[in-house]
């Protein structure tokens, strides 16, 4: 092995380099010293480093490492942050459109029910938004509340408009009768099923994206241990003490050091891979009744159908409710009277199937494809960081932590390090508490994602089919089946494309299908066009 080059007799180069790190030269010896007080850059001869310099190098090494880690994750972080924000905004827009569609349906078909219907619809969709954003609200309660509120208004305004004002105290009786008599048939249950399934999936999708951000933020801001700081210092700076300013660390040596420093972080890898694959599975199942865009934008039609169902049964209902609520002031508001079965419309309820082009669905899949390119992010981190910091190619004429070598030998390097610092010990310490916490959160979300992954076969649940509804598929080439009944309905070939291209922002006055065009809200439209088109500033 070649002898080390002669050290700088005046430590001049070391002084000028160190001054860039730490203004002032009081810590730098003018000429090489024995360095017996050094703890990291243990000298084999005279050295241009002091204990204070060594401490500064350690601090700088740890900061460098943190910056390298942050730049390594910047593209991934940007991808998830932007998509989480874009999807959340897009879901809010879908909810707003769904509300406007429903209000427009009431205005066009049942003007006598407004403005009360608008109030109930508004409250329902507020609950939907709160649920998506993580509120602990029960979907069945939300749907029940919508129908509980609507029925007294439907009864007093549509079915029995001649009721005197004094009879309005029957509202409470009607509210109870709504459930007891199943006045809307199975429509409330159908809506509960569709809304709960689609919103659950939407909510967990957003939760998963937000956890992804939290994972990156956690590993992004890791504070590296003093042991790691010593290893990094030895790799990046100890050569300077010998006046070897231009020498680069050996690549193999860098990998060993990085694997030691990042042993805890790399433990995330298994759960990160599972996270991306589970998220992909979830996204693959987000269609039909598991797609909130599809379900919510079709709700106006199902609610319309449910009101038509009430109207079809108006004769029997009016008679029954006349008996039930005649003495509403005297009776306790709980019905014990169950009439003979009302007319049940065994209508084929077809659940809409949205073409995937230009919809939120295609954007979700695009995001997954981009995320999958980061599936090995954590296992590849040590290598990535070494490839983005100065290392000698081919491990020739490089620094191995103690001296300049012609060729790097991992065994020799490890033997040389034993008396200074035990790499194996660092690995055995296990992950930082914050890393352990984030691993626990990943385990939890992965379990949720697995639980939520959809059965692919049938559109409607079996129990719904058994209760008087038949599930029917819309052919892929057909127009949507979602708004097939009633005046003023629309057939939606492709919902978000419809929203984007026609630039509708429906107000109450703009019924679905009405000819007048509202002023487009540019920010909403651009949201759909730009959804998921994430271009990292690094690319």
């Amino acid at each position: 092995q070649p002898p080390p080059p002669p050290p700088d007799a005046t430590c001049h180069q070391v002084r000028s380099f160190f001054q860039r790190l730490q203004p002032g030269l009081k810590w730098v010896p003018e000429t090489p010293v024995p360095g017996s007080d050094l703890q990291v850059c243990l000298p084999k001869g005279p050295t241009c480093c002091s204990r204070k310099m060594e401490e500064k190098y350690q601090l700088t090494a740890r900061l460098n490492m943190e910056q390298l880690l942050q730049s390594a994750s910047m593209e991934l972080k940007f991808l998830i942050i932007q998509n989480a924000a874009v999807f959340q905004e897009a879901f809010e827009i879908v909810v707003r459109h769904a509300k406007n569609y429903t209000n427009a349906m009431f205005k066009n078909n049942y003007p006598s029910l407004t403005p009360q219907a608008f109030e109930f619809v508004g409250e329902f969709f507020t609950d939907v938004s709160l649920y998506i954003l993580g509120s602990d609200i029960n979907v069945d309660d939300m749907v029940n509340e919508l129908f509980d509120s609507l029925f007294p208004v439907i009864y007093t305004q549509l079915m029995n408009p001649g009721l005197p004002d004094s009879a309005l105290d029957i509202n409470e009786c009607l509210r109870g009768a709504r459930r007891d008599l199943k006045v809307f048939g199975n429509f409330p249950k159908l809506i509960m099923t569709q809304v709960s399934k689609s919103l659950q999936v939407t909510r967990i999708f957003l939760q998963a994206l937000n956890l992804g951000i939290e994972v990156i933020n956690t590993t992004d801001h890791l504070k590296f241990s003093k042991d790691c700081g010593r290893m990094l210092t030895r790799m990046w700076y100890c050569s300077y003490c010998q006046g070897l300013m231009m020498v680069k660390p050996c690549g193999g040596y860098c990998n060993v050091v990085m694997q030691g420093c990042m042993a805890g972080v790399v433990e995330i890898d298994k759960y990160w891979r599972e996270y991306i694959l589970s998220l992909e599975e979830l996204v693959n199942g987000m269609y039909r009744i598991y797609d909130m865009e599809n379900v919510l934008l079709g709700l106006f039609s199902t609610i319309h159908d449910s009101i038509q169902y009430v109207q079809k049964n108006a004769g029997k209902l009016t008679t029954t409710i006349g008996k039930l609520c005649a003495h509403s002031q005297q009776r306790q508001y709980r019905s014990a009277y169950y009439p003979e079965d009302l007319f049940i419309d065994k209508k084929v309820l077809k659940v809409a199937h949205v073409e995937h082009e230009e919809t939120l669905s295609s954007r979700r899949r695009e995001l997954i494809q981009k995320l999958k390119s980061f599936i090995s992010f954590y296992s590849a981190l040590p290598g990535y960081i070494c490839s983005h910091s100065p290392v000698a190619e081919n491990d020739t004429l490089c620094w191995n932590g103690q001296e300049l070598v012609e060729r790097y030998s991992q065994k020799a390097a490890r033997n040389g390090m034993k008396n200074q610092f035990n790499l194996h010990e660092l690995k055995m310490k296990g992950p930082e508490p914050v890393v352990s916490q984030i691993i626990d959160k990943l385990k939890h979300i992965n379990q949720l994602l697995r639980t939520m992954s959809m059965p692919k076969g049938r559109v409607l649940d079996k129990n719904l089919d058994e209760e008087g509804f038949e599930s029917g598929d819309c052919g892929d080439d057909e127009d949507e089946c979602i708004g097939g009944s009633g005046d003023g309905m629309i057939k939606v070939k492709n919902q978000l494309r419809f929203l984007a291209e026609l630039a509708y922002d429906l107000d109450v006055d703009d019924a679905p299908g009405n000819s007048q065009q509202a002023t487009p809200k540019d920010n909403e439209i651009s949201t759909f066009h730009n959804l998921g088109n994430v271009h990292s500033p690094l690319k």
Partner: antibody, heavy 121, light 110 residues
Framework: QVQLQESGGGLVQPGRSLRLSCAAS????????MTWVRQAPGKGLEWVSS????????YYADSVKGRFTISRDNSKNTLYLQMNSLRAEDTAVYYC??????????????WGQGTLVTVSS | QSALTQPPSASGSPGQSVTISCTGT?????????VSWYQQYPGKAPKLLIY???NRPSGVPDRFSGSKSGTSASLAITGLQAEDGADYYC??????????FGGGTKVTVL
Amino acid sequence: QVQLQESGGGLVQPGRSLRLSCAASGFTFSTYAMTWVRQAPGKGLEWVSSISSSGESTYYADSVKGRFTISRDNSKNTLYLQMNSLRAEDTAVYYCAKDRRGSHADAFDVWGQGTLVTVSS
Amino acid sequence: QSALTQPPSASGSPGQSVTISCTGTSSDVGGYNYVSWYQQYPGKAPKLLIYGNSNRPSGVPDRFSGSKSGTSASLAITGLQAEDGADYYCQSYDSSLRVVFGGGTKVTVL
């Protein structure tokens, strides 16, 4: 007419338990969310706990979480508040309130007259 | 959860107007959430005046009106009457659906 009547209040020692009840009449109890609100002497209103119409969802103020439990029996039109590990700062008039809606606490359109709970040794 | 912020007192002569403010955060008043207002006389239970930011239950005079903008809400009483002297509380809920009240405003009719 619509009415809420609280009962079960009284004097209790710190660390002990008490169960408040609220009997509802004049409305379809099972379709509305219900809430307990308290008011310490000379102080403002403080929300304690809420429960959705089905009883599936319950919500608690941080100050009572883990000590108080809200529940309802829709067949009896009754709301309950089980108060354990009572403290001096729990002394207040406890109001039972009906929500306008069923899904969660939003606005309280009917209130009981309140029952006084005094926690003192 | 911290209380919404209300001024402790407000006053006006009969026939005048009084406005009470209620300030919250983006997670309660400023979110999707609705604001309600209550009137309370000493020793009595509160009474709902406004729900859903600006809606009046039947029986509440139209002298009372509510509004919401951003993270603030306000209750306006026009044509102040002697019986309007009472405590007024705003109320909303946060993103966890936990209810939050304001500290209360004592309105004095001079």
